[in-house]
């Protein structure tokens, strides 16, 4: 993940009794919340692996990098980081692995400088559509977020509240067009089977998109055309069987793109011919010499770059094992 790493500066720990005594008041300039480590020089607060059940109220106003990883927060309510005075400097917030299952509307409001947010490794059964936009207006104030890390946020099957997980995440990404400035989006390891049509067109500033280790079976309706700034597209470890002409042309038309396609179950029949031709010519696919056929059986483990049209005939019926990843 691309969240900030800690500075080597010295950290001060606070005694647990100090914070509770003043939590209702504005924090003192040098105060550090209970169970946290603070470095004013590094503008960093770490409250890591402390089983916290809520966000400390007495965070120092200087905090620029806040680590709240490995806790038991469960719910992030509206205004979870709203303070008087506001945490105006907070730029990087890491909440990964904190057992969050609900992030409510406006959870990140009143953080005017927040550029990096990492919610990875939380079983987010309930991510409000307005978690990042803060309001249900059709056009919200632009979010300052530049990097949003949402790897492995899929909850267990029995906690998914009988609705589309893909849809829930997409709603939060698109609400109010607040994330138009987003440059890095990581959505790896979320069991995504599909992306709703045109979703990426609404995130035009993307430079880096990570969709690896999902279950995407097709990119036919995923348009990359508007993503002219896209530099890296990670599609490794999905269930892609072939990329069709429209997708190939769109990828080739992106000026800075690097695409990663390893470990997909490519079907090497006659429909693969265009992709093989493209792979032989393109420079955009990283490690293209590692791409191999998964099906039909006679083609298993053949390198795509080594195939010619005579190798690619139709029409196989896939065995059940290849139907769903």
């Amino acid at each position: 993940s691309s969240s900030p790493t800690s500075s080597a500066s010295s950290f001060s720990s606070s005694a647990p009794f100090l914070a509770s005594a003043v939590s209702a008041q504005p924090p003192l300039p040098d105060q550090c919340p209970a169970l946290c480590e603070c470095s004013e020089a590094a503008r960093t607060v770490k409250c890591v692996n402390r089983n916290l059940t809520e966000v400390p109220t007495d965070l120092p106003a200087y905090v620029r990098n806040l680590f709240l990883t490995g806790n038991q927060l469960a719910v992030l309510p509206a205004g979870a980081f709203a303070r008087r005075p506001p945490l105006a400097e907070l730029a990087a917030l890491n909440l990964s692995g904190s057992r969050l299952d609900e992030v409510r509307a406006g959870a990140f409001e009143h953080l005017p400088s927040l550029r990096q947010l990492d919610l990875s490794h939380n079983p987010l059964a309930d991510l409000s559509p307005f978690a990042f936009s803060g309001s249900n207006a059709s056009v919200s104030a632009p979010s300052p977020l530049v990097e949003l890390i949402l790897n492995h946020i899929v909850p267990p099957e029995d906690e998914r509240q009988n609705r589309s997980f893909e849809g829930m995440v997409v709603a939060a990404l698109l609400a109010g067009r607040a994330l138009q400035g987003l440059r890095r989006l990581e959505l790896a390891s979320n069991h995504f089977l599909y992306l709703p049509r045109d979703v990426l067109a609404q995130l035009p500033s993307l430079r880096h998109l990570d969709l690896s280790n999902n279950s995407l079976v097709s990119l036919t309706y995923v348009s990359f055309r508007n993503l002219t700034h896209l530099e890296s597209l990670h599609l490794e470890d999905n269930a892609l069987k072939v990329l069709h002409n429209g997708t190939l042309a769109e990828l080739q038309g992106l000026p800075h793109i690097r695409v990663f396609l390893d470990n997909n179950p490519w079907v090497c029949d006659c429909h693969m011919a265009d992709m093989v031709t493209w792979l032989k010519e393109t420079e955009v696919v990283q490690g293209k010499d590692r791409l191999t056929c998964a099906y039909p059986e006679k083609m298993r483990n053949r390198v795509l770059l080594e195939l010619n049209s005579a190798d690619l005939d139709c029409d196989p019926i896939l065995p059940p094992s290849l139907q769903t990843s």
Partner: antibody, heavy 118, light 107 residues
Framework: QVQLQQSGPEVVNPGASVKISCKAS????????MNWVKQSRGKSLEWIGD????????NYNQKFKDKATLTVDKSSNTAYMELRSLTSENSAVYYC???????????WGQGTSVTVSS | NIVMTQTPKFLLVSAGDRVTITCKAS??????VAWYQQKPGQSPKLLIY???NRYIGVPDRFTGSGYGTDFTFTISTVQAEDLAVYFC?????????FGGGTRLEMK
């Protein structure tokens, strides 16, 4: 929960026009394409076209290109289909359906019956 | 337009039977096939998308398979509430087209 509420049944004269509405609730209207589908009595389903509520872009089945016009009103989360120059061939139940996985329709309205009769 | 030929048109079944419906596309539609159930007087309901993926809340007795042009929809153990018309649909190429439907009726 997701709901698509369609307008009521219509009985119209040949040559007339009709405009069917489909009010969406329970999801972000602009995030998903809206499809329209025709079902004649005792028959299969025919895809009429779809519309992207985000920008109003449409995609029609050529068969219905001169018959149907799809529009949306984002302010009211409502999709519309206008059918013109109606004949008895156009008597059917018309459904609006929200797209989930691309092309597949995961929520359907209750249907609007259109009867063309003189 | 891609034609989806669905067979059979009718199926007489008993509770507990295994039922298989097939759909053949006039040209390859890759893995872009959905299956719907329509009960009398109701709107269609999405059961399967991308050939084999059950939609949310759909019981696991409903399965789909296939690739390219030939697709199969199976109900492993038919129950009384499964009596309905089932449709396949290709979503590979516009216009999206449906099969003619298969009506499941009890013996």
């Amino acid at each position: 929960q997701v709901q698509l509420q369609q307008s009521g049944p219509e009985v119209v004269n040949p040559g007339a026009s009709v405009k069917i509405s489909c009010k969406a609730s329970g999801y972000t209207f602009t995030d998903y394409y809206m499809n329209w589908v025709k079902q004649s009595r005792g028959k299969s389903l025919e895809w009429i076209g779809d519309i992207n509520p985000n920008n109003g872009g449409t995609n029609y089945n050529q068969k219905f290109k001169d018959k149907a016009t799809l529009t949306v009103d984002k302010s009211s989360n409502t999709a519309y289909m206008e059918l013109r120059s109606l004949t008895s061939e156009n008597s059917a139940v018309y459904y609006c359906a929200k797209e989930g996985p691309p092309g597949a329709m995961d929520y359907w309205g209750q249907g609007t019956s259109v009867t063309v009769s003189s | 337009n891609i034609v989806m030929t669905q067979t059979p048109k009718f199926l007489l079944v008993s509770a507990g039977d295994r039922v298989t419906i097939t759909c053949k596309a006039s040209q390859s539609v890759s893995n872009h096939v959905a299956w719907y159930q329509q009960k009398p007087g109701q709107s269609p309901k999405l059961l399967i998308y991308y050939v084999s993926n059950r939609y949310i809340g759909v019981p696991d007795r409903f399965t789909g398979s296939g690739y390219g042009t030939d697709f199969t929809f199976t109900i492993s153990t038919v129950q009384a509430e499964d009596l309905a018309v089932y449709f396949c649909q290709q979503v590979y190429s516009s216009p999206f087209t449906f099969g003619g439907g298969t009506r499941l009726e009890m013996k």
